[in-house]
């Protein structure tokens, strides 16, 4: 039978082994944790001529001087942007991005590596990599960036037309979108026979103005003009009653890669406009 001393001895040995194992595990996790950090991006779209955001977040580091952010783009041999030791390091920046990029320097410390891209060009489309190095380790994530033009449509009653007509206009789209009319009353109806859509090239020879006219409009109905390309989908609604006209517009960026659809409602203002006294709608 084992003596009390032996039991104590083996108990202590067991405790030491368990503790050593636990410490080894902790150290192991600590070391492996320093090798890889989580970096997250969201696929997005840029509107030509405007400023865009390439979204990227990472596990923050307590020391700004230990954080390195590098943005790369497929097919581009210089860096899109580099931020290190608390400031921009642009000696390796590619010519095509010169003077057009910035990180949110005050937000880097909290894990925001998003890139602001000024004056978005059609050629900015492509695959980007957000590459992060911190004292914890390194990580990266790719981002698909689409570029085009998209704008809010406005639907108005066409007072100049000879018949009961609605006019849907959107100033800037690219690539050429499809335009579909729909109505609340005649759901599922095909309005292609009673509508006419034209695309007018804008002065910069890339984007186009979209104009679509819908004929044979009836009163007390809500009509929707839906403009869509592979980047965005915009809808302009108009409700015409005997006493007023209500309008609503909505633009949604189509973002198949992201788990959450980037959807923004602009100009959700209902404009109350008196009907023209001479406009007689059926």
């Amino acid at each position: 039978m084992a003596s009390l001393g032996q039991i104590l001895f083996w108990s202590i040995i067991s405790i030491i082994i368990i503790l050593a194992g636990a410490i080894a595990l902790i150290i192991g996790f600590g070391i492996s944790g320093r090798h890889s950090i989580t970096v997250t991006t969201v696929a997005s779209a840029g509107n030509i001529g405007e400023d865009g955001i390439l979204s990227c977040t990472f596990e923050p580091d307590i020391k700004l001087s230990d954080i390195v952010i590098q943005w790369l783009k497929e097919g581009v041999l210089g860096l899109v942007h580099e931020f290190k030791e608390g400031k921009d390091e642009l000696s390796e920046q590619d010519e095509m991005f010169r003077g057009r990029t910035a990180v949110f320097a005050d937000q880097v410390i909290v894990g925001n590596a998003s890139l602001r891209l000024k004056n978005v060009q059609l050629t900015d489309a492509g695959t980007y990599k957000c590459y992060i190095i911190t004292s914890k380790g390194k990580g990266n994530a790719n981002l698909e960036y689409k570029t085009g033009a998209f704008s809010m449509p406005e639907v108005n009653v066409d007072y100049n037309a000879s018949s009961e007509t609605l006019r849907c206009e959107a100033p800037r789209w690219f690539p050429q979108p499809t335009v579909v009319w729909a109505s609340q009353v005649d759901q599922g109806a095909n309005f292609s026979e009673v509508s006419n859509t034209s695309f007018e090239l804008n002065s910069e020879n890339v984007t186009m103005k979209v104009v679509s006219v819908l004929y044979n409009v009836t009163i007390n109905n809500t009509y929707s003009c839906m403009i869509e390309n592979d980047i965005a989908k915009a809808t302009g609604d108009i409700k015409v009653t005997e006493s007023e006209i209500k309008r609503r517009s909505h633009l949604q960026l189509l973002n198949s890669k992201a788990s959450l659809c980037v959807s923004s409602f602009f100009a959700i203002s209902w404009a109350l406009l008196p009907l023209s006294p001479y406009l007689m709608l059926k």
């Epitope: 590098q70 790369l72 783009k73 497929e74 097919g75 581009v76 041999l77 210089g78 390796e92 590619d94 010519e95 095509m96 050629t123 492509g126 695959t127 980007y128 990599k129 790719n142």
Partner: antibody
Framework: EVQLLESGGGLVQPGGSLRLSCAAS????????MNWVRQAPGKGLAWVSA????????YYADSVKGRFTISRDDSKNTLYLQMNSLRAEDTAVYYC??????????????WGQGTTVTVSS | DIQMTQSPSTLSASVGDRVTITCRAS??????LAWYQQKPGKAPKLLIY???SLESGVPSRFSGSGSGTEFTLTISSLQPDDFATYYC?????????FGQGTKVEIK
């Protein structure tokens, strides 16, 4: 299958010209930057020239600057290297290679089989 | 220009040996370092990129490590198919630089 196929090599006299071609297939050629790399007989690899995916930016090793011109025709999925004022030291096997910036950090993941250029009188 | 120096130039080893090739950069590089394998009369083949990432289809006996100026390629257990010349390559400022190569031959 991702493939690069060089052609246009041959024997040329010093001071002469040659145009190498590299036909790409199996990937979206216009997306990627491309390189020419050469290997002199019994020697190591040496980078010659690079072109961006858009074709708007070109880069050269000092040894070929002003003599060689890299270009691409995305409609034909073809990369070119126009070599003028050739010298004996330009004798080498010339490889074209696809540069993967995003996935492989400027590594060259696809190479052609090479075409031999011999500059001799 | 950044110079890349490989050592040794030639390495004699046997099947099953653990082999290490070193590559030194003349100045610190971002980790944009790749390793290639080349067999006589063939095109180079990418093995490792970003200093330590294994290219898909490359056997796991190949591994890369290092940062700053010193990098290593390790073959944990040399196989008959591994006798070849190995090159390190760095990228910086629109220029690629290769090491002079390390020939791994049968002892």
């Amino acid at each position: 299958e991702v493939q690069l196929l060089e052609s246009g090599g041959g024997l040329v006299q010093p001071g002469g010209s040659l145009r190498l071609s590299c036909a790409a297939s199996g990937f979206t050629f216009s997306t990627y930057a491309m390189n020419w790399v050469r290997q002199a007989p019994g020697k190591g690899l040496a980078w010659v020239s690079a072109i961006s995916g858009s074709g708007g930016s070109t880069y050269y090793a000092d040894s070929v600057k002003g003599r060689f011109t890299i270009s691409r025709d995305d409609s034909k999925n073809t990369l070119y290297l126009q070599m003028n004022s050739l010298r004996a030291e330009d004798t080498a096997v010339y490889y074209c290679a696809k540069v993967d910036v995003v996935a492989r950090y400027y590594g060259m993941d696809v190479w052609g089989q090479g075409t031999t250029v011999t500059v001799s009188s | 220009d950044i110079q890349m120096t490989q050592s040794p130039s030639t390495l004699s080893a046997s099947v099953g040996d653990r082999v290490t090739i070193t590559c030194r950069a003349s100045q610190s590089i971002s980790g944009w370092l790749a390793w290639y394998q080349q067999k006589p009369g063939k095109a180079p083949k990418l093995l490792i990129y970003e200093a330590s990432s294994l290219e898909s289809g490359v056997p796991s006996r190949f591994s890369g490590s290092g940062s700053g100026t010193e990098f290593t390629l390790t073959i944990s257990s040399l196989q008959p198919d591994d006798f070849a010349t190995y090159y390190c390559q760095q990228y910086k400022s629109y220029s690629w630089t290769f090491g002079q190569g390390t020939k791994v031959e049968i002892k």
